[in-house]
Interface confidence: low
């Protein structure tokens, strides 16, 4: 429905607190380098303006679109040209091109310092001194580092962040109370950011149809008792919510997400029996809970799919009349029967079915042509099953760290042109699939593993898109969203790669490695491993293992030495020489 003033409408719907938080997130996601204080100033100005529009919707400029209002405000930043370079050119454009321009300049890997966690007492003092500023700072720091973070979900994280400090800063042992909560929020936050990044990539790179297909499959698995029409309605609403958030329309997105949660809870009897607990929670918790809710039980005695989609004489008629609806019904029916399949596998099956109908419905005898279509599904199902089985066996044999190392070697050989930090980050995350998914029974392994891998490979794709260096990565990332993982799995060693020149500096280590956390030390070692493979792509597993074992022993020895720095200098030279000899560098 049309409102005289969009900004007044959203302010009233969301309330001042959420309005301010969402505008701060939006601004921080667009201008990622701007100081906190500048953003707070802009947000306060927008908020004051919104209040005047609430008082009088006919007041000057209150009828302007949110993009116009926000864009005008961002373009008042004095240092735009010096800080952002060509992004300043966006300000010369008119809406909607200006907003599109801002979106294109979002940086998935901004050059920002790593967030260092202060001492607990320091954090608690800051929290007590100015709770509002402390929480705004959290929103700002997360939003600018994760420019596609799902904004309404970030409000939920901030609520949990506040609750943690409120409670733990009064506890006898503040650290024991607070630190696990912050670790949990950090880990969940990274996962949430990566999952949302895939949704935005799906919408932006492959279009609304691709996202809707994903949503039909996932919601049909989650709500198998819901009718197709109900699932379709949810898919439409969910697509609108994510389109808005991915497009920077955070106020509309948060408002529509709240409406969707309200709808789901009012209609839970026709959606899922698992929603009761979620629907008793406050808004932010409710929306989060619904998004994570477990799959409902499958209805008993579902008929065979073949009757409607293979044996029926009306298959081509139904397909011709409403292709996307018929394919949507196929995807719905298949997905609700297969919570044991990954969403991407279900989408591959639907694509195969679509391709078969396209070909067969134009043939002389369509039924004869598509009669065996379900047989074509078998190899598509077995491929991820076998891959997961092999990799889980490898994970169980090696443990997480060494499994990550195996993937580091594998992926560096496939795409050695990719930057070392990206290869380390992506391979470490790929390796986490083991501890995340291999513990699950067979029926849950594939949806856990393959859909998680889709999220991680999307990280590789968005990081690579910023500075493309490998045609093979570009090809796997852009050809098909659902076949990204099989595409990367199928890559062999890149025979065209010219090995990197050996640089002793890359393998020079200092005593500071001894004070690093176990995770940071692992990253240092894994960085060295990637560099080794880039120097010697033909090195065998045995050679690399021998060098890495020597390296681990060297670090351990020097960290125990009295004069650590001397040990690293002298023993390091010996290690480099020995490694060069072992690898024939």
């Amino acid at each position: 429905d049309a409102h005289k003033s969009e900004v007044a409408h959203r302010f009233k719907d969301l309330g001042e607190e959420n309005f301010k938080a969402l505008v701060l997130i939006a601004f921080a996601q667009y201008l990622q380098q701007c100081p906190f204080e500048d953003h707070v100033k802009l947000v306060n100005e927008v908020t004051e303006f919104a209040k005047t529009c609430v008082a009088d919707e006919s007041a000057e400029n209150c009828d302007k679109s949110l993009h116009t209002l926000f864009g005008d405000k961002l373009c008042t930043v004095a240092t735009l040209r010096e800080t952002y370079g060509e992004m300043a050119d966006c300000c010369a454009k008119q809406e909607p091109e200006r907003n599109e321009c801002f979106l294109q300049h979002k940086d998935d890997n901004p050059n920002l310092p790593r967030l260092v966690r202060p001492e607990v007492d320091v954090m608690c003092t800051a929290f007590h001194d100015n709770e509002e500023t402390f929480l705004k700072k959290y929103l700002y720091e997360i939003a600018r580092r994760h420019p596609y973070f799902y904004a309404p979900e970030l409000l939920f994280f901030a609520k949990r962040y506040k609750a943690a400090f409120t409670e733990c800063c009064q506890a006898a042992d503040k650290a024991a109370c607070l630190l696990p909560k912050l670790d949990e929020l950090r880990d969940e936050g990274k996962a949430s950011s990566a999952k949302q990044r895939l949704k935005c990539a799906s919408l932006q790179k492959f279009g609304e149809r691709a996202f809707k297909a994903w949503a039909v499959a996932r919601l049909s698995q989650r709500f198998p008792k819901a009718e197709f029409a109900e699932v379709s309605k949810l898919v439409t609403d969910l697509t609108k919510v994510h389109t808005e958030c991915c497009h920077g329309d955070l106020l509309e997105c948060a408002d529509d997400r709240a409406d969707l949660a309200k709808y789901i809870c009012e209609n839970q009897d026709s959606i899922s029996s698992k929603l009761k607990e979620c629907c008793e929670k406050p808004l932010l918790e409710k929306s989060h809970c619904i998004a994570e809710v477990e799959n409902d039980e499958m209805p008993a005695d579902l008929p065979s799919l073949a009757a409607d989609f293979v044996e029926s004489k009306d298959v081509c008629k139904n397909y011709a009349e409403a292709k996307d609806v018929f394919l949507g019904m196929f995807l719905y029916e298949y997905a609700r029967r297969h919570p044991d399949y990954s969403v991407v596998l279900l989408l591959r099956l639907a694509k195969t079915y679509e391709t078969t109908l396209e070909k067969c419905c134009a043939a002389a005898d369509p039924h004869e042509c598509y009669a065996k279509v379900f047989d074509e599904f078998k190899p598509l199902v077995e491929e991820p099953q076998n891959l997961i089985k092999q990799n889980c066996e490898l994970f169980e044999q090696l443990g997480e760290y060494k499994f990550q190392n195996a993937l580091l070697v594998r992926y560096t050989k496939k795409v050695p042109q990719v930057s070392t930090p990206t290869l380390v980050e992506v391979s470490r995350n790929l390796g986490k699939v083991g501890s995340k998914c291999c513990k699950h029974p067979e029926a849950k392994r594939m949806p856990c593993a393959e859909d998680y891998l889709s999220v991680v490979l999307n990280q590789l794709c968005v990081l690579h898109e910023k500075t493309p260096v490998s045609d093979r990565v570009t090809k796997c990332c852009t050809e098909s969203l659902v076949n990204r993982r099989p595409c990367f799995s199928a890559l062999e060693v890149d025979e065209t790669y010219v090995p990197k020149e050996f640089n002793a500096e890359t393998f020079t280590f200092h005593a500071d490695i001894c004070t690093l956390s176990e995770k940071e030390r692992q990253i240092k070692k894994q960085t060295a491993l990637v560099e080794l493979v880039k120097h010697k792509p033909k090195a065998t597993k045995e050679q690399l293992k021998a060098v890495m074992d020597d390296f681990a022993a060297f670090v351990e020895k020097c960290c125990k030495a009295d004069d650590k720095e001397t040990c690293f200098a002298e023993e390091g030279k010996k290690l480099v020489a020995a490694s060069q000899a072992a690898l024939g560098l």
Partner: nanobody, 119 residues
């Protein structure tokens, strides 16, 4: 139904060791941070140690740092507490609990196992 069953308590001399176990069922153990709390006779609840769902990181109350080690085996849905260099002041009823994500209220915890340190 959520169940947490502690075991391994007993009488031990100062300086001795014990290993407590907690068998969990009825919830997804491997996605839940877990903790040990204790209640000395006539005292309130005291945090002992917390462990992240993945097994790291771990946290300890200052009073047990360097002496106690928390660990978990997600494949067995079991939480452990290795207690070394025990002191008389460690005497208490030890409970394992599911670490809550937001509000600090223990929705689920066990019956407890008694540790008595005495010569």
């Amino acid at each position: 139904e959520v169940q947490l069953l502690e075991s391994g308590g007993g009488l031990v001399q100062p300086g001795g060791s014990l290993r407590l176990s907690c068998a969990a069922s009825g919830f997804t153990f491997d996605t839940s941070s877990m903790l040990w709390v204790r209640q000395a006779p006539g005292k309130g609840l005291e945090w002992v140690s917390v462990i992240h769902q993945s097994g790291t990181p771990t946290y300890y109350a200052d009073s047990v740092k360097g002496r106690f080690t928390i660990s978990r085996d997600n494949s067995k849905n079991t939480l452990y507490l290795q207690m070394n260099s025990l002191r008389a002041e460690d005497t208490a009823l030890y409970y394992c609990a599911k670490f809550p994500s937001s509000r600090m209220k223990f929705d689920y915890w066990g019956q407890g196992t008694l540790v008595k340190v005495s010569s």
